[in-house]
């Protein structure tokens, strides 16, 4: 006999990276008929929602109107149908950005390179941080981490056209508090030959989300995105 229900999905809208003082909604999708959803933050109960009517709703939203460093961290959710509880969702890392300072991102040998050329990004921030993050716009949200006192190196190795795109970096004051994003750097990769065996796991990011949302000063900018697996967000573990 089943002792628990399947775990729900958890994600953040419009994004799991939220500028300080902006709004974010944490979504939890379970099953129709769930009478209660609980949102847990850093292992403790954070909020409860009881959908009405439960048989017509399989998703709830927890609204955070004013993001700050105290709200940044790991969230998970569970739901209940009758007396039976679900497994907990995967962890959602909610990150507060636009904290303190803005790093500088540069790329060597330059923003335009030949397919097969070795490329390295450099993220520099003169204030106290030792962890840096490099992100690329795209479909998944793999984030590269680098370390250094004021600057981190991100060697991409020999690049292919798969590396083309717009990159930004952040300084990280802790796992869930990041700086403002750097100015974007657009990497162009040209070359008549492309060897797919050199193609890396593409360090990409949801294309039209973070570039606009992270930099906007309009609090009302909200974008609805199709559900994407929260596991892509679990970059920090």
């Amino acid at each position: 006999q089943q002792q628990t229900l399947p775990k729900p999905f958890i994600w953040a809208e419009p994004h799991f990276m939220v500028p300080s003082a902006k709004q974010v909604t944490i979504c939890c999708q379970g099953n129709y008929g769930a009478v209660e959803y609980q949102l847990h933050f850093e292992g403790s109960l954070f909020a409860v929602d009881r959908p009405k009517p439960p048989e017509r709703i399989n998703k709830v939203k927890f609204y955070i109107p004013d993001m700050n460093s105290r709200m940044a961290g790991q969230y998970s959710c569970i739901y209940r149908v009758g007396e039976l509880w679900s497994e907990p969702s995967n962890l959602l890392d909610l990150v507060v950005t636009a904290m303190y300072d803005t790093p500088t991102l540069s790329v060597h040998p330059g923003p335009e390179v030949i397919s097969g050329e070795k490329v390295t990004f450099y993220c520099r921030l003169d204030t106290a941080t030792s962890m840096f993050l490099l992100l690329k716009e795209g479909r998944s949200s793999h984030v590269q981490r680098g370390y250094g006192k004021v600057q981190a190196e991100f060697p991409l190795g020999p690049v292919t056209t798969a590396h083309r795109g717009t990159y930004r970096c952040f300084g990280s004051y802790n796992n869930h508090a990041w700086s403002f994003p750097s100015e974007p750097v657009k990497l162009l990769v040209t070359g008549d030959i492309e060897n797919t065996s050199l193609a890396p796991e593409d360090p990409t990011f949801p294309a039209d989300t973070w570039g606009t949302y992270l930099l906007t000063t309009e609090t009302g900018l909200q974008k609805d995105h199709a559900l994407w697996d929260h596991t892509a967000q679990n970059l920090l573990r």
Epitope: S106, H108, P109, G110, P111, E112, V113, I114, S115, G116, E117, K118, P158, L188, T190, G191, D192, I193, E194, N195, L198
Partner: antibody, heavy 116, light 107 residues
Framework: EVQLQQSGPELVKPGASVKISCKTS????????MHWVKQSHGKSLEWIGG????????SYNQKFKGKATLTVDKSSSTAYMELRSLTSEDSAVYYC?????????WGQGTTLTVSS | DIVMTQSPATLSVTPGDRVSLSCRAS??????LHWYQQKSHESPRLLIK???QSISGIPSRFSGSGSGSDFTLSINSVEPEDVGVYYC?????????FGAGTKLELK
């Protein structure tokens, strides 16, 4: 010590082709792209194009597409540039240069003279 | 294509002078700007990379500054062996382009 040793001067007739070599030593050939630069007498420098030795990816200045072909031989750590359908306008000194960000090492230059 | 404009075309100097060579890009190239020196009948030699980064083996009297579209190569006390042509190069976008050069000569 990094060295780029180019082939000697060439005197060729109009309409002919020529292949200039650039033999490298002192570093891992496949780790840097190799570029070619033209310098006509008393003039500035013109970038012809570059090639990544590891996979042979190339990028050309539009002006030299159809004129220059860049290749490499990884086994001998040598880069080549072939110039075809030569005219007097192609008479110049041609340099190979390693791109380590900037062009940090240059060959000694190959003088090409196109004359009938 | 990014056009690199150097000025002056020729600079007549006396040993010991401090001189500044200018390079302007037709659009912003951030700090992807490199400087080369070419002496008569020699290959170009890298002097400064990424606008201001010094190169091992290059005398400390050579320095670079600037970002965006305006750049300067400075020689704080010219030596007779500094005579030659100085080129700036766009390292930002293909085609990679060079300035027409500034000829440094002794008075």
């Amino acid at each position: 010590e990094v060295q780029l040793q180019q082939s000697g001067p060439e005197l060729v007739k109009p309409g002919a082709s020529v292949k200039i070599s650039c033999k490298t030593s002192g570093y891992t050939f496949t780790e840097y792209t190799m570029h070619w630069v033209k310098q006509s007498h008393g003039k500035s420098l013109e970038w012809i194009g570059g090639i990544s030795p590891n996979i042979g990816g190339t990028s050309y200045n539009q002006k030299f597409k159809g004129k220059a072909t860049l290749t490499v031989d990884k086994s001998s750590s040598t880069a080549y540039m072939e110039l075809r359908s030569l005219t007097s306008e192609d008479s110049a000194v041609y340099y190979c240069a390693r791109r380590g960000g900037s062009f940090d090492y240059w060959g000694q230059g190959t003088t090409l003279t196109v004359s009938s | 294509d990014i056009v690199m404009t150097q000025s002056p075309a020729t600079l007549s100097v006396t040993p010991g002078d401090r001189v500044s060579l200018s390079c302007r890009a037709s659009q912003s190239i951030s700090d992807y700007l490199h400087w080369y020196q070419q002496k008569s009948h020699e290959s170009p030699r890298l002097l400064i990379k990424y606008a201001s980064q010094s190169i091992s083996g290059i005398p400390s009297r050579f320095s670079g500054s600037g970002s965006g579209s305006d750049f300067t190569l400075s020689i704080n006390s010219v030596e007779p062996e500094d005579v030659g042509v100085y080129y700036c190069q766009n390292g930002h976008s293909f085609p990679l382009t060079f300035g027409a050069g500034t000829k440094l000569e002794l008075k």
